[in-house]
């Protein structure tokens, strides 16, 4: 004959454990039902009555089968530098992740505790390692033959255009200026040019008609008295 199915609460056989979704109540010394996700134990079981479960209140949750007396509080609302990627429900906590242009500088079990803006590389520097959800951008000086004239968390160093006749040689922060109407060729616009490992040498020293006209890192950028538009910190 098949063994009879025991209904909770029941006393377990010596040496055995309670079944799945049951827990052993030390006071009652019985196997009792757990509450499902989204619920909590309102009344604990006795020798004669099973656990009484109740739904979690607003802004509280339980994610697992449980016998906790109170549901867990959902985390605080996401800050302005975060987006809510998972809402607070009776069965799950709110999850906040960093909004685009930011990365997680201090993570927690789920989501992010502290977001920080991605580093922006200034002219003469390009993105050598892009930012991710959990790591900042790494900027590197543009190698000879490449330049970046922007302050950006995404722009890489791009190759100088090749001129028939050079009017102004390029440098780390400025493209070459050609005297002819069009360059003989320009590298593919999508080509990635990260700094190359080279032996120690002086940066940006290219043959130029007049070295004094091509300083090591010069810029052609618009002037203006207004603060930079990248954010309140200018960074």
């Amino acid at each position: 004959l098949p063994a009879q199915v025991a209904f909770t609460p029941y006393a377990p056989e010596p040496g055995s454990t309670c079944r799945l979704r049951e827990y052993y109540d030390q006071t009652a010394q019985m196997c009792c039902s757990k509450c499902s996700p989204g619920q909590h134990a309102k009344v604990f079981c006795t020798k004669t009555s099973d656990t009484v479960c109740d739904s979690c209140e607003d802004s509280t949750y339980t994610q697992l089968w449980n016998w906790v007396p109170e549901c867990l509080s959902c985390g605080s609302r996401c800050s302005s530098d975060q987006v809510e990627t998972q809402a607070c429900t009776r069965e799950q906590n709110r999850i906040c992740t960093c909004r685009p242009g930011w990365y997680c500088a201090l993570s927690k079990q789920e989501g992010c505790r502290l977001c920080a803006p991605l580093r922006k590389c200034r002219p003469g520097f390009g993105v050598a390692r892009p930012g991710t959800e959990t790591s900042d951008v790494v900027c590197k000086p543009c190698a000879p033959g490449t330049f970046s004239n922007t302050t950006s968390s995404t722009d890489i160093c791009r190759p100088h255009q090749i001129c028939n006749v050079v009017a102004i040689p390029g440098n780390a922060s400025m493209d070459a200026v050609c005297t002819s109407t069009s360059p003989t060729r320009s590298m593919a616009p999508g080509a990635v040019h990260l700094p190359q490992p080279v032996s120690t040498r002086s940066q940006h020293t290219q043959p130029t008609p007049e070295p004094s006209t091509a300083p090591s890192t010069s810029f052609l950028l618009p002037m203006g008295p207004s603060p930079p538009a990248e954010g309140s910190t200018g960074d």
Epitope: A128, C139, K140, F219, P228
Partner: antibody, heavy 119, light 106 residues
């Protein structure tokens, strides 16, 4: 916390060379370039050059191009600045400073190394 | 090379005074100008970068501004710990420090 710790004071004869070290801690050494800046007694600050520890790329001020060599050893997170053919007017405090290539420039400095050139 | 002309070279002031130090670039340097504070026997300390941006931990009495190629560091109300030497630094076209301004107690 971020720290740049430099080697101790040096006394050198004219014509000799000096090598100053700058040990970095508290951040990823290869993610920042290291600048070297000097300051003669009672004078202003003078930029000498930078090194990218990752690749060894350098950029030197014209004034120092023929006499300075900047290197780095990533295994010990240390940058070095060697100045050769020393003259009495090279007597100065030499500083290292880090730079991440963002608009936030030279946000951490070493304590400085006094180099005295005297016969 | 771009030259940075800093003025005045020295300045006497009292606690509570409003003080301005000016740096003029010989060419356009966009907003790539920083201000450093240096006390005797110490390394320089970054106060302001990108012309306007206050470095973390620097008191809000320090501020930076710009008009064309003229850049200004303002200390709104001098505190005893502010007496030091201040340097501007351009990092747009190469790298160049201004000559410095020694701020002394009147």
């Amino acid at each position: 916390q971020v720290q740049l710790v430099q080697s101790g004071a040096e006394v050198k004869k004219p014509g000799a060379s000096v090598k100053v070290s700058c040990k970095a801690s508290g951040y990823t050494f290869t993610d920042y370039i290291i600048h070297w800046v000097r300051q003669a007694p009672g004078q202003g600050l003078e930029w000498m050059g930078w090194i990218d520890p990752d690749y060894g790329n350098t950029d030197y001020a014209d004034k120092f191009k023929k006499r300075v060599t900047m290197t780095a050893d990533t295994s010990i997170s240390t940058a070095f600045m060697e100045l050769s053919r020393l003259r009495s007017d090279d007597t100065a405090v030499y500083y290292c400073a880090r730079d991440d290539g963002s608009p936030l420039v030279m946000d951490a400095w070493g304590q400085g190394t006094l180099v005295t050139v005297s016969s | 090379d771009i030259q940075m002309t800093q003025s005045p070279s020295s300045l006497s002031a009292s606690v509570g005074d409003r003080v301005t130090i000016t740096c003029q670039g010989s060419q356009n340097i966009d907003n790539y100008l920083a201000w450093f504070q240096q006390k005797p026997g110490k390394a320089p300390k970054l106060l302001i970068y990108s012309t306007y941006s206050l470095q973390t931990g620097v008191p809000s009495r320090f501020s930076g501004s710009r008009s064309g190629t003229d850049f200004t560091l303002t200390i709104s109300s001098l505190q005893p710990e502010d007496f030091a030497t201040y340097f501007c630094f351009q990092y747009n076209n190469g790298y160049m420090f201004g000559g410095g301004t020694k701020l002394e107690l009147k």
